[in-house]
């Protein structure tokens, strides 16, 4: 766009002798600038297209030469389960809901000490339009929340089988499942055990070797022949989910303050929020940097607190 600027200056120079430029000349100059602008925009568009094409053209597939690596040690797993399972864990913290009643506001400061200061001052006079309103600052009384770890283990030895038809007696179906899932032609392998639940039409198949489950799971279905009818059962990964470190916590928010005493105000909530924000931004009012303000002048609102 620098070029654009230079061209404009050039045109201005050509048409700007020291003498006074008349209206006609002025109009002509604007027209010329507009034309030049359109021309430049087209040129930019063309160059951008070319650039995109060039980018595609210059994307290269490089065969990186083989690197010789020196293995210093072999990590021996403590037990077989490290090989037979894929583990992952998730930390889950619930958000704690708080209902802001009519005439209340929540203000969150960037710093804890500012929030504490605002609470300790308790009474604050906030100018809202032509009203000098006295609001009370209190800590936010929060309900209890929960925090826990979800520990997921995906087995490399087991699979879930569902949609098993109820066409055989339990012992026979167990044998039939083992027989079918041991067929290498279908990606199966030696079966260690079959846990079959006739009622739910599901089973857990445990294989002897690692890798068989992965092979079977490449397809979502598996053939199960019973008296010449091919039933297609559904296969899915076998996962075990454990809940760990379940904690219930409660307390008060360190950076958020509850403001009460705004019941009589009939104004737009956003305007009031801005005014509260402005008031509490000022150090002379005992405030500091504000993160967010949420005000309820009509219907109660739900605010969610998280760690």
């Amino acid at each position: 766009m620098e070029a654009d600027k230079d061209d404009t200056q050039q045109i201005l120079k050509e048409h700007s002798p020291d003498e006074f430029i008349k209206d006609e000349q002025n109009k002509g100059l604007i027209d010329e600038i507009t034309k030049k602008n359109i021309q430049l925009k087209k040129e930019i568009q063309k160059l951008e297209t070319e650039l995109q094409e060039a980018t595609k053209e210059f994307q290269i597939k490089e065969d990186i030469p083989e690197t010789k690596m020196k293995f210093l040690s072999v990590e021996t797993p403590e037990n077989d389960s490290q090989l037979s399972n894929i583990s992952c864990s998730f930390q889950v913290s619930s958000k704690v809901p708080y209902e802001i009643q009519k005439g209340q506001a929540l203000i969150t400061f960037e710093k804890e000490e500012v929030a504490q200061n605002v609470v300790s001052m308790s009474k604050h006079h906030v100018q809202i339009k032509d009203v000098n309103l006295e609001v009370t600052a209190k800590p936010v009384p929060l309900n209890s929340g929960v925090r826990f770890q979800v520990y997921v283990e995906v087995s490399k030895m087991k699979i879930n089988v569902t949609e098993i038809p109820d066409t055989l007696r339990e012992d026979q179906m167990r044998d039939k499942l083992e027989l079918s899932f041991s067929k290498s032609r279908n990606g199966g392998g030696e079966v260690d055990r079959v846990d079959y639940d006739r009622q739910s039409g599901s089973a857990v198949i445990t294989f002897v070797e690692i890798g068989v489950a992965d092979k079977i799971l490449k397809k979502k279905e598996y053939p199960l022949y019973i008296n010449q009818t091919c039933h297609r059962v559904t296969v899915s990964p076998y996962t075990e989910i454990h809940l760990k470190k379940y904690q219930i916590f409660s307390g008060t928010s360190k950076r958020t303050v509850l403001l009460t005493g705004m019941e009589g105000i009939q104004m737009d909530e956003e305007i009031v929020e801005d005014l509260i924000n402005i008031h509490f931004q000022r150090a002379k009012n005992g405030g500091g940097e504000v993160d967010v303000v949420k005000c309820s002048l009509g219907q109660p609102h739900i605010a969610y607190f998280e760690e």
Epitope: L168, D175, E178, S180, F181, S182, N186, R193, I226, Q228
Partner: antibody
Framework: QSLEESGGDLVKPGASLTLTCTAS?????????MCWVRQAPGKGLEWIAC????????TYEASWAKGRFTISKTSSTTVTLQMTSLTAADTATYFC?????????????????WGPGTLVTVSS | ALVMTQTPSSVSAAVGGTVTINCQAS??????LAWYQQKPGQPPKLLIY???NLESGVPSRFKGSGSGTEYTLTISDLECDDAATYYC??????????????FGGGTEVVVK
């Protein structure tokens, strides 16, 4: 691959006897049932019992054999048949046979491997 | 219980001829039928499984057919070596009963 029966003998009525079938060249797996079939002199084949060679070891007996004949898997290459309260009608050649599953495209079975048989004679 | 009825009990034919053995099941066996050949003093030998599939090494002169409850074994171009007793057999999975297994009564084939 072969099967061999042992334990056949001449016993008195009311006696018990255990027959053993030993597999060579293969070990039991999920693809078959190991079975016992008998044949009385000059008569036809009669199915006695089968045991699934897979992990469950499910057993199936002919209705007439229930309670008197028990099939069991004693190792990955041996199957036994325990017979009690034997009578003259139980005199026969007892075959051990492998019932194989041809179920790649269907639910087909066949006794594709047999032992030579062992003779059991029940006589006073 | 599963019952297999085999007919005839005996059949004779000349070398080069054809014999047909029938087998009837007491219930639908869904083509899960096998045929065996047994010679005196020997264990049976599997010829056909799944009603019509030839076991490896078995000559194509042996042909199985049928479905439902009716099955047939046809031996064509009879040879002296085909003289034996032939048995049909089926095993069946069930929803209500034990897995059943049964043999037919046998058919003696005499080659003249």
């Amino acid at each position: 691959q072969s099967l061999e029966e042992s334990g056949g003998d001449l016993v008195k009525p009311g006696a018990s006897l255990t027959l053993t079938c030993t597999a060579s060249g293969f070990s039991f797996s999920s693809s078959y049932y190991m079975c016992w079939v008998r044949q009385a002199p000059g008569k036809g084949l009669e199915w006695i019992a089968c045991i699934y060679a897979g992990s469950s070891g499910s057993t199936y007996e002919a209705s007439w054999a229930k309670g008197r004949f028990t099939i069991s898997k004693t190792s990955s290459t041996t199957v036994t048949l325990q017979m009690t309260s034997l009578t003259a009608a139980d005199t026969a050649t007892y075959f051990c046979a492998r019932e194989y599953s041809y179920d790649d495209y269907g639910d087909f079975w066949g006794f594709n491997l047999w032992g030579p048989g062992t003779l059991v004679t029940v006589s006073s | 219980a599963l019952v297999m009825t085999q007919t005839p009990s005996s059949v004779s034919a000349a070398v080069g001829g054809t014999v047909t053995i029938n087998c009837q099941a007491s219930q639908n066996i869904y083509t899960n039928l096998a045929w065996y050949q047994q010679k005196p003093g020997q264990p049976p030998k599997l010829l056909i499984y799944g009603a019509s599939n030839l076991e490896s090494g078995v000559p194509s002169r042996f042909k199985g057919s049928g479905s439902g409850t009716e099955y047939t074994l046809t031996i064509s171009d009879l040879e002296c070596d085909d003289a034996a007793t032939y048995y049909c057999q089926s095993s069946l999975y069930s929803r209500i009963a034990d897995r059943a297994n049964a043999f037919g009564g046998g058919t003696e084939v005499v080659v003249k």
